[in-house]
Every structure is written in C-alpha cells, then in structure tokens.
C-alpha cells in the first residue's frame, strides 16, 4: 500500500494509473467503500462522501490512463485509505494528513516560549524536526518547545514531519518582538546634544502600545522616570516628561530621544520599556550615557568620565604632536603643571577611541 503525506489546508494528488493508455471507467472510494468520485460516460460524477466537494480529477489526463484524485483544503480527518478501482483492479493509497501550528500567537516577545503542536491522524507515530532561522535544530513528537526565544529566532522555521519513511515540510513564520539591540552606549563630551535611538527588530502593520524611560544617574541614589509616551499606529506622542532633563521625542518610529546637553549629572544608565497592545510582557532596551569633561584649574589639567564604563577602558591625557601621555584604567586622569599646547583626552577600548575631548593649555608667564 502506497503512503502519501499531506499538509492540513493544502492540496494533495493521489495517483492511479491504468495499464491501457485510454479513457476507461474508474472510481475512487474511501475505506467505508463510499464513492468519492468516478467517471460516468465522459463525465466526472461525485459520490456522497464528505470529501466529494473538495475532490476532483484531471480530466485532461484520463485518455492517458491517469485517473488521479485531487483533494483540496486537506483536513486531518481526511486521513484514510483511499481505493482506486480501475480495469478490475484495486489500488490502495494511505493518506496521512498532518498539521503544525504555533499554539499561541506567532508574534512573541523575546524571552517568551514558543510551542509548536503537531496535529496528526489517530494511530500515526510521526517525528518532528524543526530548524530555526539561525540554524538551531529541535526535535520532538507531538509538541516542540523553544523555552526562551531570542532575536535571531525571528523568521521562517522549517519543520519536517516524518512518518513511514516519508516526509512533509512545514514553514512557520515567527516574529520575535524585540529591539534591535539589547544594550547600547552613547559617549558624549559635556555640553553636546545626545541622541538615543531604539530601533525595533520587527515590523508590524499596526503598532500600538506605551513606553517609558527610567534613568539611574550615576550620581543619584534612585532611578527616576524621564519620559512616558504612547504609540498609536506607529505614531509617538509624549505623555509626561521630567523638567530636568527636558527630553524631546521623535513623532515617528524608530523611537528617538534627544537630550539637549550631556552633563555629568545625567551620566548613567536607562531602561526603555515598551508594552505592546494585546501582548503580555514588555520589550526592553538598556541605554548608557558616558560623559567626558576636560578642565584646567590652576596648575592641574584633569580629564574625567562619568557613567557606566568597563574597567578595561583606558583614559588618557596626551599632548598633541608630543610624546607626553598619562594613561590609566580609571575614571579620571590628571597632569600637574601641563606643558602649553593642545591636549587630548581620550577614552579608548583596546586602542579604539570611543570619546575624545580637546583642551588648550596656555603658557603661564
């Protein structure tokens, strides 16, 4: 007996061939022996089987001795043994219809779990193997679980269902709702304008929700809400903003915040949360602000940074076109009685300059 695997909602063609390449009488029946379709004279007739309204045959191939049955919009309950009767012989085809669905919305928040459920006919014992867009392989039986979705899990998942050495492939589009970056750091000199951008890693037809930026300044004992906003159909509107600092927010996506001036008291880290309508949980992005200040006071040239910096970052004071350099893995460096000239304060990571500030030291006569 031939085994054919089908996908729920798809179309399948069950073939049946006569030895004579000519138009002859044929019938397709189900395992209850009830007629689905057949030929009467030159016409296709339909039996009363519940499949009849979704079954058809390629009339153009009848004179070649091909009497296939096409079943549209397959259902799990279409799984059955079908019998083709032609030239006094019977050909049996076992059709097994499978369905694979995500048992929740396919738009999931980062960190949430994804469960794929296999619908299968009674008595079948299929195995399922899924491959994520990032190349992760997961195997299972009736259900497949991905406990914690990551950004890279967004995209088309390819799942292969195997039964009786036959396979059928399903493609499921999963959208992981997250920001493009989990964390970002902005490095600015004191007084410069600061731009914070929070691009999303997905696109939705209608995007509605609300968000807030909480800020923990390095110098402050507790965090505070800097801004709250609403998102309606990709349009941003500010609900509440602190007086100090007075943030500005772009009206369109991507979410964009402007801090008029980088000041040491603002240096620190923030957490932008976005709650989407009809979704449980929130999207998060961490943002850090590092501020640099270079000052000369009497005989002391000082360079300082505020905000979250890694211990491996190097802070240096260097006289332009001269070899004189002071470097430390610290948040402040200074030079006593500096030479006159243009001094550079550099914050660098393994030789890569992250932030630079110039200060001119004038000669003292």
């Amino acid at each position: 007996k031939k085994v054919v695997l089908g996908k729920k909602g798809d179309t399948v063609e069950l073939t049946c061939n006569a030895s004579q390449k000519k138009n002859t009488q044929f019938h397709w029946k189900n395992s209850n022996q009830i007629k689905i379709l057949g030929i009467q004279g030159l016409f296709l007739t339909k039996g009363p089987s519940k499949l009849s309204d979704r079954a058809d045959s390629r009339k153009s191939l009848w004179d070649q001795g091909c009497f296939s049955m096409i079943i549209k919009n397959l259902k799990i309950e279409d799984s059955d043994t079908y019998i083709c009767e032609v030239e006094n012989k019977k050909e049996e085809v076992e059709l097994l219809v499978f369905g694979l669905t995500a048992n929740s919305d396919t738009h999931l928040l980062e960190g949430q779990s994804l469960t794929l459920t296999l619908e299968s006919p009674p008595g079948s014992s299929p195995s399922v193997k899924c491959r994520s867009p990032g190349g992760k392989n997961i195997q299972g039986g009736r259900t497949i679980s991905v406990p914690q979705l990551e950004r890279q899990d967004s995209g088309t998942w390819t799942c292969t269902v195997s039964q009786d050495q036959k396979t059928v492939e399903f493609k499921i589009d999963i959208v992981v709702l997250a920001f493009q970056k989990a964390s970002s750091t902005v490095y600015k000199k004191e007084g410069e304008q600061v731009e914070f951008s929070f691009p999303l890693a997905f696109t939705l037809e209608k995007l509605t929700g609300s968000g807030e930026l909480w800020w923990q300044a390095e110098r402050a004992s507790s965090s505070k809400s800097w801004i709250t906003f609403d998102l309606k159909n990709k349009e941003v509107s500010v609900k509440r903003v602190t007086q100090d600092p007075k943030l500005q927010m772009g009206k369109k996506l991507p979410l964009h915040l402007t801090l008029p001036q980088a000041l040491p008291q603002y240096a620190g880290s923030g957490n932008l949360t976005l709650a989407l309508e009809a979704k449980t949980g929130k999207l998060h992005q961490e943002v850090n602000l590092v501020v640099m200040r270079a000052t000369q006071f009497q005989e002391n040239l000082t360079c300082e940074v505020w905000g979250p910096t890694s211990p491996k970052l190097t802070l240096s004071l260097k006289l332009e076109n001269k070899g004189a350099t002071v470097s430390k893995q610290a948040k402040a460096v200074w030079v006593l009685n500096p030479e006159a000239g243009m001094w550079q304060c550099l914050l660098s990571d393994s030789g890569q300059v992250l932030l630079e500030s110039n200060i001119k030291v004038v000669p003292t006569w």
């Epitope: 209850n32 007629k35 039996g47 009363p48 009849s52 979704r54 309950e77």
Partner: antibody, heavy 120, light 107 residues
Framework: QVQLQESGPGLVKPSETLSLTCTVS????????WSWIRQPAGKGLEWIGR???????TYNPSLKSRVTMSVDTSKNQFSLKLSSVTAADTAVYYC??????????????WGQGTTVTVSS | DIQMTQSPSSLSASVGDRVTITCQAS??????LNWYQQKPGKAPKLLIY???ILETGVPSRFSGSGSGTDFTFTISSLQPEDIATYYC?????????FGGGTKVEIK
Amino acid sequence: QVQLQESGPGLVKPSETLSLTCTVSGGSISTYYWSWIRQPAGKGLEWIGRINTSGSTTYNPSLKSRVTMSVDTSKNQFSLKLSSVTAADTAVYYCARELERYYYYGMDVWGQGTTVTVSS
Amino acid sequence: DIQMTQSPSSLSASVGDRVTITCQASQDISNYLNWYQQKPGKAPKLLIYYASILETGVPSRFSGSGSGTDFTFTISSLQPEDIATYYCQQYDSLPLTFGGGTKVEIK
C-alpha cells in the same frame, strides 16, 4: 440522542422566499452533513441539498438556482432559503442528518417535518 | 442525475403474503442503494443499505437484493405493522435521488 426540529412559516406567498431553520439538539452539529428533503402531498421524496459546518454546500441541480443553505454553529442550527416559490413548492419539508458508515450513506436522523403551503 | 423508478406504485396484500417491490436505476449504481419505510405522518426510517444489508434492529422478514441497475425489496411475510410507503434511494452519486415510492396496504 440527536433530535432535529424544523421551524418557519407554514404559509408563503407565490414569488416570495421560503425560509426554514432546523435546530439540532442532543448532539453537536459539527463533522456531519445536514440535508433538506421535501415531499409534496401524496408524492415521493426529493433531496434539496446539504451543508456542513464549514459552510460547504451541494444542491440538487433541479433547484440550485433558487436554493441557499447556511449554518450557524453557535446556535446549532442550519437553514434553508428557497426563492421565487410557486404552488409546486408546497410540500412537507424535512431536515435530516446525513451519515456515512461502512457501505452505507444516507439520512439516519430526521426532523418530524413541517408543512409549507405556497398560496396567495 | 440518476433516475430511480419504483414499481408498483401501490399494492394490496394479505397478512402473511410475500411482497416484492422493484427499483430500477437509470445507470449502474453498483450496490449503493437504501430502502426506507415511511409510515403516515412520520419521517422515513432506514431498513436496508448497500442493496442487501439489514439495518440493526430491523426484522429479518425484510430483505433486499440486486446490483447494477435492478434491485428488489421483499417482505417475506407481511405483517399489519408493515403498512407504509417504501422508498428506494441511491447513493452512488450526487444528487441523492429517491424512487417514487410504493404504498403497501393490507387487503
């Protein structure tokens, strides 16, 4: 067990639309085909057509241009509409459940029938 | 459509008589034939399916035979409760069609 009950007006004017509803009780409407059969007084049975819970229909070609069937799974009901009626449509209208078993296909549960008279 | 022709349209027989009704299909319907019994004011009731298989609970005095286009329904010994109209119905292809019916009366 499953019971069927037809309901609708007993008198319809010529050229108007006959509307009947069949309520299924004691069981689910899903997974079956549900049909309408009519029988003019003293005459034989005529299969009008059938519908399933997906809304898929098959109508008798002799009535196809005038017949519309619909289903409301939330109410466990299915309906028949027959337009442009004439006196020839006067009959007892039955709703029935179609059942498939090994070697068998037919109507296994019937309503008690409702008489519809077409007259002005 | 497949036409089903039943004969006779009516018959009168005595209790205990053997009663035979025939049904002819306009084309080959294999064995896809049901026989129904309808009593006055009631809905039809299935007696025989697939031309000759007796439905569960139906008395054995009822039987059916035939294949292709010609079918026969028999009541081996007519009983008073058998007074009814009998219909054949094909289920080889859609639309499902019925014979014109045979009204059985007691003499």
